[in-house]
């Protein structure tokens, strides 16, 4: 025998109290698949969370973070504070990058500058707390008489992955 509940579509639940009739999910609840015996409570985006997508009868709400914070975890389960570029977030708060390291993002930790000499190149632009070193041509190419090199216009630096 076919389970009568299997006929209940997403957005409804199989109501045992009403002869297994398909009833719509109550307000602030949803069912994303058919045949469910209960509806799930909608996620509420409160505090540092803000609503990215409202809850509907067939799908949960989706949250992201208010400005100054970024998402962590599947489905943005946590909001973590941003730091400034040139800083990293330690367990004790935001801290400036040490000499020889940089961070061009508002999250993550400080990354060591590129060592141009390892690829046989020279330093064209020194690094800062916010920017990596820019490597130029190899030192041999900079001998007298070698044509000068114009650095290319900076492209977008690697950025945030969507959560």
């Amino acid at each position: 025998l076919q389970d009568p509940c299997s006929n209940c579509p997403a957005g409804t639940f199989c109501d045992n109290n009403r002869n297994q009739i398909c009833s719509p999910c109550p307000p602030n609840s949803f069912s994303s698949a058919g045949g469910q015996r209960t509806c799930d409570i909608c996620r509420q985006c409160k505090g540092v969370f803000r609503t990215r997508k409202e809850c509907s009868s067939t799908s949960n709400a989706e949250c992201d973070c208010t400005p100054g914070f970024h998402c962590l975890g599947a489905g943005c389960s946590m909001c973590e504070q941003d730091c400034k570029q040139g800083q990293e977030l330690t367990k004790k708060g935001c801290k400036d990058c040490c000499f020889g390291t940089f961070n061009d993002q508002k999250r993550g930790i400080c990354r060591p500058w590129t060592n141009c000499s390892l690829d046989g190149k020279s330093v064209l632009v020194n690094g800062t707390k916010e920017r990596d070193v820019v490597c130029g041509p190899s030192p041999a190419d900079l001998s007298p008489g070698a044509s000068s090199v114009t650095p290319p216009a900076p492209a977008r630096e690697p950025g945030h992955s969507p959560q």
Partner: antibody, heavy 120, light 109 residues
């Protein structure tokens, strides 16, 4: 969807060089650092180095400095790892892996791996 | 020091809880990531930044980190969890930015 597809298996003689490629698709290749990690038979994972595909800036583990070169061709969304002066203990599976957009997080997408066998 | 120490193996019965440790000096000040590695497959990120799961990783996998030890916990272990697990940390040092632990083989009894 994000995909990293690596070149096929290689067999090399000691002293030779090998160049492994990693073609990226499904995202903005220039926007995310690419890392290389290897695993020798019966051994653990070992980080080798990274490249910023946007600038070409690199960093290598000290163990490999002078033998490894990581490059990229942004026009075909491909990163390369070249290892020179190969020894038998360089026999390993070599993986490319994408950093998720900032330094200090886990590597979120990996290539399928390329087996490099070094044998005389 | 840039050494992360893991036990070579951990054995657990199906349905039980497995705990895999990763030791390192003041590792609690770092952000630890965990990868699952099965034979002939690429590693899979299962926990990042101490305790966060990427999409698609089941809730029974969790992580914690304090003091000198980070821990990956797998509850209600299944046969499909049998794999090697590696912890990993990024440093700001130019010579050793990326360091992996030696790996732990999870054996399902």
């Amino acid at each position: 969807q994000v995909q990293l597809v690596q070149s096929g298996a290689e067999v090399k003689k000691p002293g030779a060089s090998v160049k492994v490629s990693c073609k990226a698709s499904g995202y903005n290749f220039s926007g995310y650092y690419m890392h290389w990690v290897r695993q020798a038979p019966g051994q653990g994972l070992e980080w080798m180095g990274w490249i910023n595909p946007n600038s070409g800036g690199t960093n290598y583990a000290q163990k490999f400095q002078g033998r490894v070169t990581i490059t990229r061709d942004t026009s075909i969304s491909t990163a390369y790892m070249e290892l020179s002066r190969l020894r038998s203990d360089d026999t390993a599976v070599y993986y490319c892996a994408r950093e998720p957009g900032y330094y200090g997080s886990g590597l979120d997408y990996w290539g399928q791996g390329t087996l490099v066998t070094v044998s005389s | 020091s840039y050494v992360l120490t893991q036990p070579p193996s951990v054995s657990v019965a199906p349905g039980e809880t497995a705990r895999i440790t990763c030791g390192g000096d003041d590792i609690g000040d770092k952000r630890v990531h965990w990868y699952q590695k099965k034979p002939d497959q690429a590693p899979v990120l299962v926990v990042y930044e101490d305790r966060y799961r990427p999409s698609g990783i089941p809730e029974r996998i969790s992580g914690s980190n304090s003091g000198n030890t980070a821990t990956l916990t797998l509850s209600r272990v299944e046969a499909g969890d049998e794999a090697d697990y590696y912890c990993q940390v990024w440093y700001s040092s130019p010579d050793h930015p990326g360091v992996f632990g030696g790996g732990t083989q999870l054996i399902i009894l």
